[in-house]
């Protein structure tokens, strides 16, 4: 496959971001035990994403370890929480905005803020530096922004877009407006590599925005940032998606990028989209 | 300068009620403020919290349902209404702003004695 | 919630390193807090977040904070460092805040 037409691959709405879950012990491998029991049980595999059916020995293990594949699903996948976009009029939170904080399971200790559905508030907590979940942002403007209300109770604002200038991305934007066209991708996509804590030298990829293409580095096995891809096709699938426009009962359509310059209508505003 | 000015302590008999207030100056008020308590003798012991605009509120199990935290932004003014007073309520109460979840401005506490 | 654990008491020569330690359950996966009381005074905050120093607070006072353990360290110790230390953290869960049980620290 050339990149070309990676590119163009449409992503369905339950495809997981990489290293962002709902729960760490989601990221465990199948721990079958030191038993010697036959019992079939489920596991979230971290690398095709699904939950997946494998045979445990009936003691120990660990937590990635579900009676049924609802239960693994329930816990581990996010058919509703990666679904960000809601309809115009409602602005609801998006729904990662109640999950807990979620440290995650390295750690490289470094300050993010998160969404407290308890005190309604966005507050600070120390992020170990991988996996955690979507509720987990590196600015307090950026959590309140996206999860804290307003005065009178709507969201403070809600996602738009903007064509930004420097690297011909779009990257989420503040938009006083209710925006009909969206651009879903992680904003994780747009930090630079980072090798991390540790002393491994694992073969890794990620997504380089100023050229707008995946490349490869070494990652040293702990730590790190999100934009961290075991391969470069999960690469460019995460980082460069689609567009998801909005329609009128909340329903999505995804639409490919194409190469020619490209006019998209906007109800309230105009945007190019240019050889992304 | 920014301060914190506790008052409405005093002796009450068990199951009586008390309503402390904190007046702030020097700074507006706006943030998320707290009281915390301490017995004679003892530690420190977080009591209850309150958001900027007086939304949310929380409380120590111990106080549950007994004690009622509150404001008034337009006075600067932070209450704690305390209702069904034990003896163990017995302490220094002092009011503090933690606008980033740790104390930064303390009250000089005011003492609640609960005894009959 | 989570637990803080302080030793009760800690003594120092004038000039030499203090440190009290406060310990709970995966601590250094939150944010410590020191707070300094003088008897017959309110609390003052020393650090902050781990390790930092609010304005007006003597250099000598650091913090660190990993694993179970957060420690405060007091170098060159004087003899107006006398007083309780508590340590504290916040719970996001419950909203609320933990206190540990305090350390008298003693200039010798």
């Known amino acids: 496959d050339s990149e070309e037409d990676e590119e163009h691959t449409i992503i369905t709405d339950t495809e997981l971001p990489p290293l962002k879950l709902m729960h760490s012990f989601c990221a465990f491998k199948a721990d079958d035990g030191p038993c010697k029991a036959i019992m079939k049980r489920f596991f979230f595999n971290i690398f095709t994403r699904q939950c997946e059916e494998f045979i445990y020995g009936g003691c120990e293990g660990n937590q990635n370890r579900f009676e049924s594949l609802e239960e693994c699903k329930k816990m581990c996948t996010r058919d509703n929480a990666n679904r960000i976009i809601k309809t115009t009029l409602q602005q609801e939170k998006p729904d990662f905005c109640f999950l807990e904080e979620d440290p995650g399971i390295c750690r490289g200790y470094i300050t993010r803020y998160f969404y407290n559905n308890q005190t309604k508030q966005c507050e600070r907590f120390k992020y170990g530096g991988c996996l955690g979940n979507m509720n987990n942002f590196e600015t307090l403007e950026e959590c309140k922004n996206i999860c804290e209300d307003g005065p009178n109770g709507f969201q403070v604002d809600n996602y738009g877009t903007q064509l930004n200038a420097v690297n011909n991305s779009l990257t989420p934007q503040s938009t006083k407006v209710p925006s009909l066209f969206e651009f879903h991708g992680p904003s994780w996509c747009l930090t630079p590599a980072d090798r991390g804590l540790c002393r491994a030298n694992e073969n890794r990829f990620y997504y380089n925005s100023v050229i707008g293409k995946c490349r490869p580095f070494k990652y040293s096995g702990c730590g790190g940032n999100e934009n961290n891809f075991t391969s470069k096709q999960e690469c460019l699938r995460a980082c460069k998606k689609g567009f998801i426009q909005r329609i009128s009962k909340g329903g999505l359509i995804k639409t490919k990028r194409k190469r020619k310059k490209q006019r998209v209508k906007i109800a309230y505003e105009e945007i190019f989209v240019k050889n992304m | 300068q920014v301060q914190l000015v506790e008052s409405g302590g005093g002796l009450v008999q068990p199951g009586g009620s008390l309503r402390l207030s904190c007046a702030a100056s020097g700074f507006t008020f706006s943030s998320y403020a707290s009281w915390v308590r301490q017995a004679p003798g003892k530690g420190l012991e977080w009591v209850s919290g309150?958001?900027?605009?007086?939304?949310?509120?929380h409380y120590a199990d111990s106080v549950k349902g007994r004690f009622t935290i509150s404001r008034d932004n337009s006075k600067n003014t932070l209450y704690l209404q305390m209702n069904s007073l034990r003896a163990e309520d017995t302490a220094v109460y002092y009011c503090a702003r933690y606008d980033n979840f740790y104390f930064d401005v303390w009250g000089q506490g005011t003492l609640v004695t609960v005894s009959s | 919630d989570i637990e803080l654990t302080q030793p009760p008491s800690v003594s120092v020569a004038p000039g030499q390193t203090a440190r009290i330690s406060c310990s709970g359950d995966s601590l250094g996966s939150k944010f410590a807090h020191w707070y300094q009381q003088k008897p017959g005074q309110a609390p003052v905050l020393v650090i902050y977040?781990?390790?930092n120093r609010p304005s007006g607070i003597p250099e000598r006072f650091s913090g660190s904070n990993s694993g179970n353990t957060a420690t405060l360290t007091i170098s060159g110790t004087q003899a107006e460092d006398e007083a309780d230390y508590y340590c504290?953290?916040?719970?996001?869960?419950?909203?609320?805040?933990?206190f540990g049980g305090g350390t008298k620290l003693t200039v010798l």
């Open positions: 977040d781990d390790s």
């Open positions: 309150i958001s900027g605009d007086g939304s949310n509120t």
């Open positions: 504290s953290t916040y719970t996001s869960r419950s909203h609320s805040y933990v």
